[in-house]
Interface confidence: low
């Protein structure tokens, strides 16, 4: 902690400006009023303070707001956010999406830090659910965000938010997560016509049951092999050769290259050889 010392004559800060970069740590502590700092936080980012000086400024805010910073201060923290600990952030009540965006911007380009994870957790819990705007924002900064949530956490995502999800946001999701997301996506996109529906639902199909795959096979969707390979094995096994052929359309020839991999391998073993022969791919059951 910085030792309490009287501010030298004429050094009392009237505003937060560049002259403060020449202040020693003890001078900042003695000469900068915490209330002034709080009202002029937006200026701090424009001033090239050292990390040590930022430590002093943080200390002053901590003293002024021992129960946690108000949102008016949080929104303008800028690089001072990098000095916050998860424990500090747990005291905050962040409700504005603009505040969240401002702080995520500071950490942009880096892996999700414990601070950011705590901030997001506080924000989402404060809102009660992952609404569309929040999901839009979080996946823009962290494409893998959705797949970092547990199935239990994903259950709080309302179907309307699914519109914000892009295919790349689901790249790292495992089957248990897709099991939760797929029914929400199905509900969200239910009023779309066949081809448009398939475009939207495609990324979520790793959670689809057999009956839905059978329905899709009747709609000329031409599913690509990459999508087919991500389907649940237990959902693929009951499909007939004709259904798989209709489901894949022109991509059905790709089954040959994948015949040793799940779910294709297990599916092949379930089919009659006569049926497999109709594909003309030389698949051996």
């Amino acid at each position: 902690e910085v030792e309490k010392t009287a501010c030298p004559s004429g050094k009392k800060a009237r505003e937060i400006d560049e002259s403060l970069i020449f202040y020693k740590k003890w001078e900042l502590e003695a000469c900068v009023d915490a209330a002034l700092l709080a009202t002029q936080m937006d200026r701090v980012n424009a001033i090239p303070f050292t990390y040590e000086q930022l430590d002093v400024l943080k200390h002053k805010l901590d003293e002024l707001y021992p129960q946690g910073y108000p949102e008016s201060v949080i929104q303008h923290l800028g690089y001072l956010f990098l000095k916050m600990s998860p424990e500090d952030i747990r005291k905050w009540n962040v409700t504005s999406l603009e505040t969240l965006k401002a702080l995520l911007e500071v950490n942009k380009g880096h892996e999700m830090s414990p601070q950011v994870a705590t901030l997001i957790d506080r924000f989402v819990k404060g809102r009660g659910q992952l609404d569309k705007d929040t999901l839009d924002t979080l996946t823009a900064f962290y494409p893998g965000y959705l797949c970092s949530l547990s199935p239990e956490e994903l259950s709080s995502v309302p179907p309307s938010s699914i519109w914000a999800v892009r295919p790349q946001d689901l790249d790292t999701c495992d089957p248990r997560q897709l099991d939760v997301l797929y029914p929400k996506a199905r509900l969200a996109f239910q009023n779309m016509n066949g081809s448009e529906y398939f475009v939207k639902i495609q990324s979520f199909l790793g959670g689809a049951p057999t009956e839905d795959l059978k329905a899709l096979s009747q709609q000329n969707v031409s599913m690509d092999l990459a999508t087919f390979m991500k389907l649940r094995t237990d959902a693929v096994l009951p499909l007939t050769v004709a259904e798989v052929q209709k489901l894949l359309g022109p991509h059905v020839e790709g089954l040959k290259a994948e015949e040793r991999h799940r779910p294709v391998r297990d599916w092949i073993l379930r089919q009659r050889q006569d049926d497999l022969d109709t594909l003309g791919l030389g698949l051996q059951g």
Epitope: V199, A226, P250, E253
Partner: nanobody, 125 residues
Framework: EVQLVESGGGLVQPGGSLRLSCAAS????????MGWFRQAPGKGLEGVSA????????VYSDSVGGRFTISRDNSKNTVYLQMNSLRAEDTAMYYC??????????????????WGQGTLVTVSS
Amino acid sequence: EVQLVESGGGLVQPGGSLRLSCAASGFTFSRNTMGWFRQAPGKGLEGVSAIPYTSTGIVYSDSVGGRFTISRDNSKNTVYLQMNSLRAEDTAMYYCATDRRPGTTMLAVNGYNHWGQGTLVTVSS
């Protein structure tokens, strides 16, 4: 190295026809979906048509359906776009693309990894 070279563009009057070609090399042409895209002056890139490697499941955008025909000759490693009943709004730079990305539709502009340099089509009287 993947190479796509478009040709066949030019100036044509409304109602006229053109046939674009895209010669491909550096990859197994017969196993890849090929797509045609275009970008009109001041506009974004849009999908026109795409053809899977089996020549089944061909797709066209609503704006060209019935007027344009896509085809491919796997022995020549070439994909074609026959454009009939051309309109002023068909004026654009036309590009062919290949190496489809998973999880995208055949006419999605983010659905392909490799692109040609383009050939200019101008429809004007």
